[in-house]
Each structure stands twice: as C-alpha cells, then as structure tokens.
C-alpha cells in the first residue's frame, strides 16, 4: 500500500493506477482528469480591494472607486456589522475587533462616515463632519503575539514560543521550505518551493514545534501561486497554502500579522529571520533545530549596485542582512518569514533568493509582502 501510494496514483472510473510522476504534468492521464485536479493553481492579481489598513494605529481606509481616492473611516455610527464587512472584503472570516482612535495632526486623507452596500463598505453620501473626531482602528484577526520575545543577538537556537507561526513545509516527509501561519486556514510561503512538485497530495505542513521531525503533519487542500508575469520573471515568488482543516491556535501555534499597506521600512530597520535551512553555504544539511537571527533592512539601491545584485532586485522585493555579511537565510529557509516587530510581529518579507549565503555585498532577497496584499485578499475572498 505504502509503495503503491508513493509511486502510483489511483484513477477512478475505471479504477486503474498511473505513475505518480504523471500527476500535474498538464496531460489528462485519468479519464476524468483527476490527475490534474489537485495541483498548484495560479490566481490572477485581481481587482483592487477597496479597503485597507494603515500603519497609523491600524486605521481603516476606504476607496472611492469613482475617483480612485482613499478616505479614512470616521468612527461615527461605525458598527460591528461594518467591521465584519470590512474584514470580509479582505478575505477574513474571523470576528474582528475595532475601537475609536483620535484623528491625529498628521491626518492627510479626508475623513468620511461609512455605510454598507451589497456587502461592501461605501462612503455615506451626505457625509458631514466627523463629529466624534475619531477614526476606526480595526483588527480583523488577533495576530503577531508570541509567548516569548527573542534576544537581539547574531544567530541562536530558537524556541517555538518566540515564533509560533513558523511551519515546516514538507514533501514526502522531507523539509523543503519554511512558511508562516496567517490564519487558521492559510499558510504563506514562496512559490519557488513548488517548482519541482506541483501535486498537492504529497505536501504537508508541520506546525507547533521548533524541532524538524517532532510534530504532526497537516493535510493541504490547495496551493495557490500568483500568475507568472513574463515581463518580470523573478517577481511573484509568493504562495498561499490552504489547509484541509483549520488550525486550533495555542501558545505554540499562532498567526503572524500581514504588514500594513504603507509599511515602508527604512534602511537599518531591525528585522528577524528564522528557519531550519543550511547553516553553511553548500553546507550539506538542514539544521534539526529552528535557528533565529537578527538582520536589518538593506537599502534596495545599495542592494542593486554593480558589486551586489546589479539591478536584479525589483520594487516587489526587498533586501535584508547585515552590512558586514555572515548572517543570512540559506537553502531550506525559503518561504519562511522576514519579520518586523512594532506592536505585533508582521511578516514583511518571504525568503526568496540570493547569491550564496551570508556574503557582505549580496544579502538575502525577500518577496515584499506589502506588494501582494491585494492578491492575498483576493485569494482569500475567492475561498471564503
């Protein structure tokens, strides 16, 4: 049975086996085509999601589709139902929390009262002044909180208490990539993790431990990548894995927050990386223990210089490392999070690529998550 499952796939009507390598090869080998059904699927970028959250206290902003202008949501008459609608527009299914926060002196958007129409937030037509003088601070999911705060050092062994969103993504029980829990159903990782194996069946997610071999595996329902753009072939290294059954959150299994749309991190901002990847470039084997390291944002212009990546780092990528080199993500860390801590932990990057590991002028290159928020929300909405 195990041998059969490993090397063969069972077609239905009529029942017969085909070699597993014929799964997801673009050819219909089963009469009903089920060999091409459970494969990595691509999903387009989709329309602009008309709500977003700002790094200014997670305040809600709403798009006026007629003019293309964004407005801040006034707290006047804002209800739980409106909060749920806003979060559903971003693809969340959990119960949101919201509160009033004072309109700040730097408020640069017009403030409008919000209503609902066809399960979408709209600006109230006769919107007068914002009488409460407050904006809506909205949280769609409790995220980014861990039991333990890491110490700021170079590289050290990590505890799952510090990084409860970290998962191991495995194919045929072998660790391939890292990933981050975003909500009970979804894990964020890199698209390039699935380049070799595009069938969903053999992929599993392991959550809740800092040791590679010691935690139960979770079945995967879907793997979704963004549509390939041939004009920018290195962009879009992002994937979402939908779990077959929702996770039960605990001290060691928790989600990390997505970044705010306006999360612009300046050079030298401290960040964290974690993973079970190689500890030496071409270093032969994965680490059994989860490792963590503090790094910092490296200016993209510097990263693109001719003694570094020579213009290969696009606007949808970011660089992180330490100026003198020596601390970096490596093979096996791919798909894992690049993290920033404000009030909560945010996944600002996904481990993507780099030349070697830990070189001084070639730091790690990460998928910039804020560039893909719209895509993430559209995927989630389609799967609600």
């Amino acid at each position: 049975k195990v041998i059969l499952d490993k090397y063969y796939f069972l077609c239905g009507q009529p029942l017969h086996f085909i070699p597993r390598k014929q799964l997801c090869d673009g050819e219909l080998d089963c009469p009903l085509g089920e060999d091409e059904e459970h494969c990595v699927k691509s999903f387009p970028e989709g329309p602009a999601v008309a709500v977003r959250l700002s790094k200014d206290r997670s305040t809600l902003q709403v798009l006026d589709s007629a003019t293309g202008n964004w407005f801040s949501a006034c707290f006047d008459n804002f209800t739980e139902a409106l909060a749920e609608t806003a979060c559903r527009q971003m693809g969340y299914s959990s119960k949101p929390t919201f509160r009033a926060v004072e309109i700040g002196p730097d408020q640069d958007l017009d403030v409008v009262e919000i209503t609902e129409n066809s399960q979408e937030l709209r600006m109230r037509n006769s919107s007068g002044p914002c009488l409460s003088g407050s904006l809506v601070s909205l949280h769609c999911l409790a995220c980014g909180k861990s039991l333990k705060t890491p110490r700021v050092v170079g590289v050290e062994e990590a505890s799952v208490d510090s990084w409860p969103w970290q998962v191991s993504i495995q194919y045929d029980k072998q660790h391939v990539c890292g990933g981050s829990i975003l909500d009970p159903h979804w894990v964020l990782t890199a698209a390039h993790c699935f380049r070799k194996h595009t069938d969903v069946f053999n992929w599993k997610v392991r959550a809740g431990s800092d040791k590679l071999g010691s935690f139960p595996s979770l079945a995967v329902a879907k793997i979704i990548i963004i549509e390939f753009n041939p004009m920018y072939p290195k962009d879009n290294d992002i994937a979402l894995m939908k779990l077959q059954f929702p996770l039960t959150f605990s001290g060691t299994v928790r989600p990390i927050c997505l970044p705010f749309f306006d999360e612009e991190l300046t050079p030298a901002t401290p960040l964290w990386i974690i993973g079970w990847g190689f500890t030496k470039q071409n270093g032969g084997k994965m680490s059994d223990i989860l490792l963590q390291a503090s790094v910092q944002v490296i200016d993209s212009t510097r990263c693109n210089a001719d003694d570094a990546y020579q213009g290969e780092v696009t606007e949808k990528m970011m660089c992180a490392g330490i100026p003198e080199g020596g601390v970096d993500t490596c093979q096996g860390d791919s798909g894992g999070p690049l993290m920033y801590q404000s009030d909560q932990w945010h996944v600002v990057g996904i481990v993507s690529w780099g030349y070697g590991c830990g070189g001084p002028s070639t730091p790690g290159v990460y998928t910039k998550v804020s560039a893909y928020l719209n895509w993430i929300y559209n995927v989630w909405k389609a799967e609600l």
Epitope: P230, M231, D235, T301, N304, Q310, G311, E312, T314
Partner: antibody, heavy 121, light 107 residues
C-alpha cells in the same frame, strides 16, 4: 562581451514596409526582455517597443502602435522589428537594446550600433 | 505618460569644471532614473542607474542624486572625453521616456 548587431535598415518609400533584425551574443538572450529605441537625425532618443523574454508580452509607444510589431526567435538569438505603413517621421537610427537585469526590463544597459531607416519618396 | 524635462539643453564648459545637469519628471518616479552618455555617431552608454548607482566601468567623477521628481547628474571634474550629449530616462513605467538631452560642449 555583449554584442547587438542590427541590420535591415535602408531607404523605403512612405507607406512601405521594412523588417529590422538584431543578432545578439555574449549573454543568455532567452532570459532577457529586449527593446527597440530610435533616434531621428539630430534629435533625442525615443523608446518604441519591448518584448518579454519568451515573446508572450509586448508593449509599444503610441507613435508606432498598430504599425510596428516586435518579435523574437530565441533559437536564433535574434530580435525583430516589423515596420509597416512607414512615414517620413519614422526616419531615424534604430537601436536594439538589452535591459540590465533579467528580472525587469525598464533599465537599458547595452545598445547596438544602430541601423539607419530613411523614409522618403 | 511620464514627461522628462532636462536642463539645460546645452552648456559650454572647460576641462576640470564641475558640471551639473538636472532632470525633472512630471510625476514621482521614486529612484527609477538612469543617465546615459552619447557621443556623435555612437550608441548611448549607461552611466548611472537607480538615480545614484554607478554602472561598472564608469569613472567615479560621474555621480547621480535625487529621488521623486528631481534628479541631478554631476561630473566633478570634466575631462576631454566627457564632451557628449547626456540623456536621463525614467525607468518607472512603460512607455519608457527620455529627457530631451543636454549637449556638453567645449568652451
């Protein structure tokens, strides 16, 4: 060393057609988007068209949209520009150009030596 | 389309002079700007990209600065081989657009 060699220019009458070629060497042609840029005598540079590494996506300047077609043959390491309905104002030196990065096409770092197209009756 | 306005259109300078050429974009382009040098009868040559990065092989007397809409190319000490026409190009979005050029002539 990167080399881009344009050919196919010459004298053509208004309304006529011409096909320019650009033979590329010294880099992995099939990994890079490619451009055509022109320069009218004594004037500045005008970007015309770009094609993705696999030929599936093309963008054109408004001035040539519907008249010019950019294409490529990766097996021959060659870029083409098919120019139809030519006008006097299309008279220029035509350059084939390579982007600096394979990850994005918007920055050009190598240019061919150019081929002169003259549209005149 | 993004318009690129270069100034001056021409300038006269002597060997050893410090020369500054400016380029203004009609809308913000972050640091997506390149500078090219072109000599008569030759193809353009990339000098600066990402507004400030020096292309390898280009002498360090060339430097770029700016972000958003206003950019500058500076030649700290003009050499005889620097007499040429200089173009800026926005690399922010298609269609790619170039400035009108600045011709640097011998005084």
């Amino acid at each position: 060393e990167v080399q881009l060699l344009e050919s196919g220019g010459g004298l053509v009458q208004p309304g006529g057609s011409l096909r320019l070629s650009c033979a590329a060497s010294g880099f992995t042609f099939s990994s890079y988007a490619m451009h055509w840029v022109r320069q009218a005598p004594g004037k500045g540079l005008e970007w015309l068209a770009v094609i993705s590494f696999d030929g599936s996506i093309r963008h054109y300047a408004d001035s040539v949209k519907g008249r010019f077609t950019i294409s490529r043959d990766n097996s021959k390491n060659t870029l083409y520009l098919q120019m139809n309905s030519l006008r006097a104002e299309d008279t220029a030196v035509y350059y084939c150009a390579k982007p600096k990065a394979s990850s994005g096409p918007r920055l050009i770092d190598y240019w061919g030596q150019g081929t002169l197209v003259t549209v005149s009756s | 389309d993004i318009q690129m306005t270069q100034s001056p259109s021409s300038l006269s300078a002597s060997v050893g002079d410090r020369v500054t050429i400016t380029c203004r974009a009609s809308q913000g382009i972050s640091n997506s700007l390149a500078w090219y040098q072109q000599k008569p009868g030759k193809a353009p040559k990339l000098l600066i990209y990402s507004a400030v990065n020096l292309q390898s092989g280009v002498p360090s007397r060339f430097s770029g600065s700016g972000s958003g809409t206003d950019f500058t190319l500076t030649i700290s000490s003009l050499q005889p081989e620097d007499f040429a026409t200089y173009y800026c190009q926005q690399a922010n979005s298609f269609p790619l657009t170039f400035g009108g050029g600045t011709k640097v002539e011998i005084k």
